[in-house]
Interface confidence: low
């Protein structure tokens, strides 16, 4: 056959679906690889073809669209399972072609099992809620397109294994779950089960996400440098190791890039000749506030090094701060026989 633009196996789109539930999977060509959509392609006379490779097999085979009750079907650029079976796991390929053009991409589909408490190998999306912030909602994800707007599904929400009813501050409101005031105790996995009828059959969609309660932007402050500070002096003798910690607290801020760095005489350590190493450690509070510590180390400090300016800098979306460390050379204790004797005029 003629050459086909093969985008390979798109492992970035590892699709996971639950066993015995409907799944609708869009051909990734139109989402991520081609500059035109399915309608344009279709009206230009291009045909979308689906095939698959079973798990642990090398053989590409056509998808059987003649199963009882149309268990697998295609609609425009969507491959439908009504419902999935465990052995549907494999690599699926969608190919767009006519006599002069061909483009294809493969993607892995994994059908996973869940237990009665919705535990499974499914990778869960994380939804962050601000602590004590007011009413916030999470929405049952990835259910669009499964049923028409005329169908009114029933939605049941669970926290872990427990159905959410009469919870103190969590209220199910159809597709939404409202948190009146999010607290650390609201951390956990939340599942919505959407039940809807279709052609005399009842289908269930199970969607689980992880809720993580994080620091509120109302409480967010610019970075706070705990160390160095005005009270600590780093006093060293030449030849000793100089270690200075830069410890910075960052309020949680959604999508903020937190940065800490040292300058020595106004330059980054990489841009100067002295042998400096920087080690960084990061810790997080329960609400994802961050504390970063960068320890500046000079193994054998010289008297020149002890005259330099060491400044810790920090930056977040809330602002930038800097603090200089107080570094000085230790005045050596006098040795009586030489220094004091000389001081008394002895020879």
């Amino acid at each position: 056959s003629e050459r086909c633009d093969d985008w390979g196996l798109d492992t970035m789109r590892q699709i996971q679906v639950f066993e015995d539930e409907p799944a609708r999977i869009k051909c990734p060509l139109f989402e991520h690889f081609l500059k035109f959509n399915y309608s344009t392609a279709h009206s230009a006379g291009l045909t979308l073809i689906w095939y698959w490779t079973r798990q642990d097999r090398d053989l590409e085979e056509p998808i059987n669209f003649r199963l009882p009750e149309n268990r697998i079907s295609k609609e425009k650029d969507v491959l439908w399972f009504r419902p999935t079976l465990l052995n549907d796991t494999g690599n699926y390929t969608c190919m767009l072609r006519n006599t002069t053009y061909c483009s294809k991409v493969a993607f892995p589909l994994e059908v996973v099992q869940k237990d009665s408490c919705f535990n499974s190998p499914m990778k869960l999306p994380v939804h962050k809620l601000y602590i004590e912030y007011g009413i916030q909602r999470i929405t049952c994800p990835n259910v669009d397109g499964y049923f028409p707007s005329s169908v009114k599904p029933t939605i049941t929400w669970y926290m872990g294994c427990y159905k959410i009813q009469n919870f103190n501050n969590v209220i199910p409101e159809g597709m939404n779950l409202s948190f009146l005031i999010a607290l650390i105790s609201n951390n956990g996995n939340y599942t919505c089960v959407v039940t809807y009828p279709e052609n005399g059959r009842t289908f269930h969609l199970t969607r689980t996400l992880t809720v993580k309660v994080v620091g509120s932007p109302k409480n967010a402050v610019p970075p706070v440098i705990h160390s160095p500070n005005d009270h600590v002096v780093y006093e060293k003798e030449p030849g000793e190791e100089l270690l200075i910690p830069c410890t910075v607290y960052f309020s949680f801020l959604m999508d903020s890039r937190n940065e800490v760095w040292w300058t020595i005489d106004g330059k980054k350590p990489d841009d100067i000749t002295i042998d400096v190493t920087i080690n960084e450690s990061i810790s997080h509070s329960r609400t994802e506030d961050e504390t970063r510590t960068q320890i500046l180390s000079i193994k054998k400090v010289t008297s020149e090094d002890l005259k330099r300016s060491y400044v810790c800098h920090a930056r977040s979306a809330k602002g930038e701060v800097a603090k200089a460390a107080k570094v000085k050379q230790k005045v050596p204790a006098p040795r009586y026989t030489v220094e004091l004797a000389c001081g008394f005029g002895a020879t």
Partner: antibody, heavy 122, light 112 residues
Framework: EVQLQQSGPELEKPGASVKISCKAS????????MNWVKQSNGKSLEWIGN????????SYNQKFKDKATLTVDKSSSTAYMQLKSLTSEDSAVYYC???????????????WGQGTTLTVSS | DIVMTQTPLTLSVTIGQPASISCKSS???????????LNWLLQRPGQSPKRLIY???KLDSGVPDRFTGSGSGTDFTLKISRVEAEDLGVYYC?????????FGAGTKLELK
Amino acid sequence: EVQLQQSGPELEKPGASVKISCKASGYSFTGYNMNWVKQSNGKSLEWIGNIDPYFGGTSYNQKFKDKATLTVDKSSSTAYMQLKSLTSEDSAVYYCARGDVHYYGYEGFDYWGQGTTLTVSS
Amino acid sequence: DIVMTQTPLTLSVTIGQPASISCKSSQSLLDSAGKTYLNWLLQRPGQSPKRLIYLVSKLDSGVPDRFTGSGSGTDFTLKISRVEAEDLGVYYCWQGTHFPLTFGAGTKLELK
């Protein structure tokens, strides 16, 4: 200096509506919640609800859900409470009070308005 | 709703003497994050209420240290080590752990 200046006393007939205002100054209006509290003659205090001026989110005591409506005008740093279908039971002093950054003002209300006296009488 | 019960309803005191007010809640005020949102306020005659204490024992700025708040769970106490004339008025405890916020009936501190 933080100040909450409330509108003056009101005399209304039963069945009418009234809108009480609370003008904030001396702080960032959108950084704090505004709470409303009712004090009936010589009695205790009742929390009516609050509003987050930044997002406009409101929270009501169920008892006042159909009675009170809380709004804000960010441009003038003013919070409002409208009371409808007035009866003699609504005669009271109404206070606005600044809540801290917690949505329900959990840690107490650190600044209070001077109060607005509402009398409902035919 | 959480019921806040204050005792006594009236407390007659002598200037310079100590005073103690009790406040009990119908449910624990310890929230799941480990905070207890129990607050005290004072309403002097003809004035608006004023925050005295929040989070059980934290004094509001400008509140003299003769006031102390203590307690946990459902039982709380406000103590004044030596009553002064400016302390007279009605003291309210109130809770902010459970929705809706609720106040005690108040304790009137008056001169004997």
